[in-house]
Interface confidence: low
């Protein structure tokens, strides 16, 4: 008598979530009499998947009619597959008895469920940093299966190398998550820069999912300050200019002080953007020289993006200006914090 064989021809089957999976099983003989049952997993903790006698398996259907005479095909179809269905499925032959006795198992078919990763979400630092500082960006994607996944970081199209990536959990699971951190060194030119997290997975048919973050959310470019004096006008007024250049973000307050007293405060708004994404701003102050007996100390004070104020001061020499129209443009520059480096 030929020994009964339980044949599961496919070692593994891969199915997209939501699709149906067909698990094939045939037996080589009708003898001995007894049922076939399907289990997920092996050993004492295995899970019953299909048993013709019990009949309460709404998502599992036999491929061929198991009640028909001489049936040797015990393949099943599982509908509406979810990641929770992944595992190794065994077709098991039992000998009829009280109770039925397990006779032989197939080699098993591993069902891997392909589930797409969620759209990567990229988050940046909570506070802005200046050029030459390193900031971290995090990318997360969830819910994918199988576990194999690749994640790459790009800044302006160039792949980043200072990256740390983890896929969790480490062991077998119904689905997986990926979390990656990239460290980026900022430059003053990064206002228009972008970092991209790119996730590639078998379910995406070669089209990676991308999450992006703009470095404009992470960077602060401090302004340069320059104060200049124009030639004296006919009405004994001197035009003093404070040029605030190459700053980002736009949030900036400028205050003029005459001999330490606040003369005027202005807020930057609706400024045109430079090519590199930074802003420039020019403020003018008219000083009536004839109203002063002594030299006038002028200070241009700038508060940028909530940072400590930076000053640029110089003196207008009243003695250098006769009461009639003059043309002297020279001014003593007594600047403090002449370059705004913070």
């Amino acid at each position: 008598e030929e020994e009964l064989q339980v044949i599961q021809p496919e070692k593994s089957v891969s199915v997209a979530a939501g699709d149906s999976a067909t698990l094939n099983c045939t037996v080589s003989s009708l003898i001995p009499v007894g049922p076939i049952q399907w289990f997920r997993g092996a050993g004492p903790g295995r899970e019953l998947i299909y048993n013709l006698k019990e009949g309460h398996f709404p998502r599992v259907t036999p491929v061929s009619d198991p009640t028909k005479r001489n049936n040797m095909d015990f393949s099943i179809r599982i509908s509406n597959i979810t990641p929770a269905d992944a595992g190794t499925y065994y077709c098991v032959k039992f000998r009829k008895g009280s109770p039925d006795v397990e006779l032989k198992s197939g080699a098993g078919t591993e069902l891997s469920v392909r589930a797409k990763p969620s759209a990567p979400v990229v988050s940046g630092p909570a506070v802005r940093a200046t050029a030459e500082h390193t900031v971290s960006f995090t990318c997360e994607s969830h819910g994918f299966s199988p576990r194999d996944i690749t994640l790459k970081w790009f800044k302006n199209g160039n792949e980043l190398s200072d990256v740390q990536t983890n896929v969790d959990p480490a062991g077998k699971s119904v689905s997986y998550s990926i979390r990656s951190t990239a460290r980026v060194v900022l430059t003053r030119r990064d206002v228009h820069s972008q970092v991209i997290c790119e996730v590639a997975h078998v379910t995406l048919q070669g089209d990676p999912l991308r999450g992006t973050a703009n470095l404009s959310e992470a960077i602060r470019v401090p302004p340069f300050l320059e104060v200049t004096q124009q030639s004296m006008r006919a009405d004994n007024q001197v035009n003093v200019t404070c040029q605030v250049t190459k700053f980002y973000p736009q949030r900036l307050q400028l205050t003029w002080l005459e001999n330490g007293n606040v003369s005027r405060t202005e807020m930057a708004s609706a400024l045109p953007e430079n090519k590199d994404g930074t802003y420039n701003w020019t403020s003018w102050l008219l000083v009536n020289v004839s109203a002063h007996r002594d030299d006038v100390k002028l200070t241009c004070q700038v508060e940028h993006d909530g940072q400590p104020a930076v000053n640029k001061s110089f003196s207008v020499k009243v003695s250098a200006h006769p009461k009639e129209q003059g043309s002297n443009t020279a001014a003593e520059n007594t600047g403090t914090n002449e370059r705004n480096i913070y």
């Epitope: 939501g18 289990f39 997993g41 004492p44 903790g45 295995r46 899970e47 019953l48 998947i49 299909y50 019990e54 309460h56 398996f57 709404p58 998502r59 599992v60 599982i78 509406n80 979810t82 990641p83 929770a84 269905d85 969620s118 969830h142 819910g143 119904v174 689905s175 998550s177």
Partner: antibody, heavy 117, light 109 residues
Framework: EVKVEESGGGLVQPGGSLRLSCAAS????????MGWVRQAPGKGLEWVSI?????SPYYASWVNGRFTISKTSTTMDLQMNSLRAEDTAVYYC?????????????WGQGTTVTVSS | DIQMTQSPSSLSASVGDRVTITCQAG??????LAWYQQKPGKVPKLLIY???TLESGVPSRFSGSGSGTDFTLTISSLQPEDVATYYC???????????FGQGTKVEIK
């Protein structure tokens, strides 16, 4: 017939303990994820705990270590300690679907737990 | 745990009416949503799982839809035997936790 049946409910004083049991017929407890869902009088359903086919326990966040789920080859148990009045409810034993652990397709008739002094 | 918000909390409709119950998850649960029917004094009965799959033996007038955070249970033609409280239930496959909606009581006008 596939069914589950609860036992062990009763009246218990606040701070006391009670052990609920669930017996299965028509299938093996060791082959399925099993769980407990409760329903306070006149209220909605509330998930309590599940135990995987391999015996790993999972709890709702509000359980805070007061309940312990376990199972043998024949019964699934819920050990309830430090009981409070708000734990008064009908406790249902439920079996998760044969393939999808995302739903409960077999429910017992429930056992009533009353916590009162 | 994920918060499940069901609406309305109760409704009254006539026999033959189309009835819609919605359920909103506090975060995405993909399609891991089930619907249950509980008649007064009875045990909950599974109607729909995986958002839209009808459980065996459930009348085809019941249908489910939705994914992510927003889900709907529809009874295409309300019958007297449909008087019950309906619950949605989510499963979060990362935390492996379950959550039920607060229920919708359906009555006949």
């Amino acid at each position: 017939e596939v069914k589950v049946e609860e036992s062990g409910g009763g009246l218990v004083q606040p701070g006391g303990s009670l052990r609920l049991s669930c017996a299965a017929s028509g299938f093996s407890l060791s082959s399925y994820v099993m769980g407990w869902v409760r329903q306070a009088p006149g209220k909605g359903l509330e998930w309590v705990s599940i135990i995987s086919s391999s015996g790993s326990p999972y709890y709702a966040s509000w359980v805070n270590g007061r309940f312990t789920i376990s199972k043998t080859s024949t019964t699934m148990d819920l050990q309830m300690n430090s009981l409070r009045a708000e734990d008064t409810a009908v406790y249902y034993c439920a079996r998760v679907g044969p393939l999808g652990v995302d739903y409960f397709n077999i429910w017992g008739q429930g056992t009533t737990v009353t916590v009162s002094s | 745990d994920i918060q499940m918000t069901q609406s309305p909390s109760s409704l009254s409709a006539s026999v033959g009416d189309r009835v819609t119950i919605t359920c909103q998850a506090g975060q995405s649960i993909n399609s891991y949503l089930a619907w249950y029917q509980q008649k007064p004094g009875k045990v909950p009965k599974l109607l729909i799982y995986y958002a839209s799959t009808l459980e065996s033996g459930v009348p085809s007038r019941f249908s489910g839809s939705g994914s992510g955070t927003d889900f709907t249970l529809t009874i295409s033609s309300l019958q007297p035997e449909d008087v019950a409280t309906y619950y949605c239930q989510s499963w979060h496959y990362i935390s492996r936790s379950y959550a039920f909606g607060q229920g919708t009581k359906v009555e006949i006008k």
